[in-house]
């Protein structure tokens, strides 16, 4: 459906508040550097334009596509070249090669300095004073940390983040209502963020054919009654929501989230039986709500799928007319039946099936080739299984802090030239799959596990796409996006490796580290961890325990003391001296 | 399991030295901190030292420091406790106790395993 003027139909479509805010969230993922009061102008510029399309759409430049016109918009900052070095040559790009560019400069650690949440007073009196700008800013933050956020679900955030202070500044202990919310938002937040990367990057890196089978599986598990056809549309249209989304073309992607969530409430019937009380809120919480909602009930008596996928005779001749659709057909009727197994593990099932019936089909006799195909599957299931048994197993012996430690010994050992920031980071969100996952029935544990880490193993291959510093690393990333989990768990110790040069000032302390959050004292105790393992990658997993149990009893001992910065300088240095003499540092 | 037991301690005169052993057998040794502690009649059961899983970092309580050492023997299994200049006030029970996997390295919860105790008398 051809619009004279592309803007204006989404404006229109939008709504005001919404145009403003998707614009703000594009310009503030791309252009991640730029002060606040520079969006706002620009996109204060963009929305008065885009009115004046509404009121004529032949007026000048409403033909323009919302990349020229964006991209024009952002290639108008002074600053471009001083703040963004190289990505100011890609204004001197045509459509669509700018935009591309845009994207290639996304970055996803940017040096930006932490949010720091000021008192609960100061936040009332600013949401009190100026909402909009309030709300704004929340948006601006979140958008330039997080430069593939998903951009309606964003919106859904700050709707949430406002009703928060609307409700909490009013309360009569504002902290104690305010607070967990806010915690609550951020660490969902984070979550989502990191879920949508993986999404981005399985469409940027592997393709609309592998995010299109993710989606496939993943749909079949959540609405197993419905028709393949049903899954298929729902499938073609979440990738088209996607692929625009992780392109950039926010209100495009916004507007057809929104016609999505719509279609699905008017199909439920033929969708899923759980979906009726999503259907009731309005479009943001509606459209979370959906993406969110349980599998529905599996349908009763299903027949076996060897019927169609081995016994028949027809096998090769239905795969020969349409490889892709009949690959689909297998992952849909697999995954239905199967909302035990990962996504991931689904997925691997249907790439073993079509190997195998690439190479039967060719064969002289392709039935007596593929016959034994599913029992190729079983080590498939069992190796996941496995692995979620003992390390769940491991983290209720352990809890969750000891077993991240355990893991950032495990993938320090395996992958020491990544820097110690993104050890930290994806250790301890890998060792967070425990109070995750554990919890569950042996039915659930899967899913939930290994999905999840899919999603924490991307955060390490983005962040280290960035800086490659582990040939290691590259190749389980970029090999196959399903076997990412599989291929790092079967690392062994990197025998390459050259012990880190020791440097006393890693292992300096100073008494800040007593007024620190329980969380950022473990980091910091996870830091040292780190670094000693990349001095010493031979020490045995008791003697890193002891050495830390010795830090423990050091920080304690300093913390507790009068003059604590003398207590940390002196018994740091014995401290470190200690730990060299054990472990010939 | 593993058991602790100690020995070397009695009755001594202000001022005199006392040497306390410790032998543990069980789960490896040199894999745990160990720790002493006091139990004075009607008190609180009191931190006194902390020797590291080598031996080459041990922490005091401030009413001992200067006055006691802890040592060990990782071959022999043993954490020793030297007790100089003894005071009166030293009178108590020492255990020694083998550190658990959390808890603070300076209280009696975060020790796992512990000896029978040996009674340690100082008299004026």
């Known amino acids: 459906d051809a619009h004279k003027s592309e803007v204006a139909h989404r404006f229109k479509d939008l709504g005001e508040e919404n145009f403003k805010a998707l614009v703000l969230i594009a310009f503030a993922q791309y252009l991640q550097q730029c002060p606040f009061e520079d969006h706002v102008k620009l996109v204060n510029e963009v929305t008065e334009f885009a009115k004046t399309c509404v009121a004529d759409e032949s007026a000048e430049n409403c033909d323009k596509s919302l990349h020229t016109l964006f991209g024009d918009k952002l290639c108008t900052v002074a600053t471009l070249r001083e703040t963004y070095g190289e990505m100011a040559d890609c204004c001197a790009k045509q459509e669509p090669e700018r935009n591309e560019c845009f994207l290639q400069h996304k970055d996803d650690n940017p040096n930006l300095p932490r949010l720091v949440r000021p008192e609960v007073d100061v936040m009332c009196t600013a949401f009190h004073d100026n909402e909009e700008t309030f709300l704004k800013k929340y948006l601006y933050e979140i958008a330039r940390r997080h430069p593939y956020f998903y951009a309606p679900e964003l919106l859904f955030f700050a709707k949430r983040y406002k009703a928060a202070f609307t409700e909490c500044c009013q309360a009569a202990d504002k902290a104690a209502c305010l607070l967990p919310k806010l915690d609550e938002l951020r660490d969902e937040g984070k979550a989502s963020s990191a879920k949508q990367r993986l999404k981005c990057a399985s469409l940027q890196k592997f393709g609309e054919r592998a995010f299109k089978a993710w989606a496939v599986a993943r749909l079949s598990q959540r609405f197993p009654k419905a028709e393949f056809a049903e899954v298929s549309k729902l499938v073609t249209d979440l990738t088209k929501v996607h692929t625009e989304c992780c392109h950039g073309d926010l209100l495009e992607c916004a507007d057809d989230r929104a016609d999505l969530a719509k279609y699905i409430c008017e199909n439920q019937d033929s969708i899923s039986s759980k979906l009726k009380e999503c259907c009731e809120k309005p479009l943001l919480e509606k459209s979370h709500c959906i993406a969110e909602v349980e599998n529905d009930e599996m349908p009763a008596d299903l027949p076996s799928l060897a019927a169609d996928f081995v016994e028949s005779k027809d096998v090769c001749k239905n795969y020969a007319e349409a490889k892709d659709v009949f690959l689909g057909m297998f992952l849909y009727e697999y995954a239905r039946r199967h909302p035990d197994y990962s996504v991931v593990l689904l997925l691997r099932l249907a790439k073993t099936y079509e190997t195998t019936l690439e190479k039967c089909c060719a064969a002289a006799d392709p039935h007596e080739c593929y016959a034994k195909v599913f029992d190729e599957f079983k080590p498939l299931v069992e190796e996941p299984q496995n692995l979620i048994k003992q390390n769940c197993e491991l983290f209720e012996q352990l809890g969750e802090y000891k077993f991240q430690n355990a893991l950032l010994v495990r993938y320090t050992k395996k992958v020491p030239q990544v820097s110690t920031p993104t050890l930290v980071e994806v250790s301890r969100n890998l060792g967070k799959v425990g109070s995750k996952c554990c919890k569950h029935p042996e039915a659930k544990r899967m899913p939930c596990a290994e999905d999840y880490l899919s999603v924490v193993l991307n955060q390490l291959c983005v962040l280290h796409e960035k800086t490659p510093v582990s040939d290691r690393v590259t190749k389980c990333c970029t090999e196959s996006l399903v076997n990412r989990r599989p291929c790092f768990s079967a690392l062994e110790v990197d025998e390459t490796y050259v012990p880190k040069e020791f440097n006393a000032e890693t292992f300096t302390f100073h008494a800040d580290i007593c007024t620190l959050s329980e969380k950022e004292r473990q980091i910091k105790k996870q830091t040292a961890l780190v670094e000693l393992v990349k001095h010493k990658p031979k020490a045995t997993k008791e003697q890193l325990k002891a050495v830390m149990d010795d830090f423990a009893a050091f920080v304690e001992k300093c913390c507790k003391a009068d003059d604590k910065e003398t207590c940390f300088a002196e018994e740091g240095k014995k401290l470190v001296a200690a730990s060299q003499a054990a472990l010939g540092l | 399991q593993v058991q602790l037991v100690e020995s070397g301690g009695g009755l001594v005169q202000a001022g005199d030295s006392l040497r306390l052993s410790c032998a543990a057998s069980g789960r490896t040794f040199s894999d745990y901190a160990m720790g002493w502690f006091r139990q004075a009649p009607g008190k609180e059961l009191e931190f006194v030292a902390r020797?590291?899983?080598?031996?080459?970092?041990?922490y005091y309580a401030d009413s001992v420091k200067g006055r006691f050492t802890g040592s060990r023997d990782n071959a022999k299994n043993t954490v020793y406790l030297q007790m100089n200049s003894l005071k009166p006030e030293d009178t108590a029970v020492y255990y020694c106790a083998q550190r658990g996997d959390s808890g603070s390295n300076y209280d009696p919860s975060g020790y796992r395993y512990w000896g029978q105790g040996t009674q340690v008398t100082v008299s004026s």
């Open positions: 020797i590291n899983w080598s031996g080459t970092l041990t």
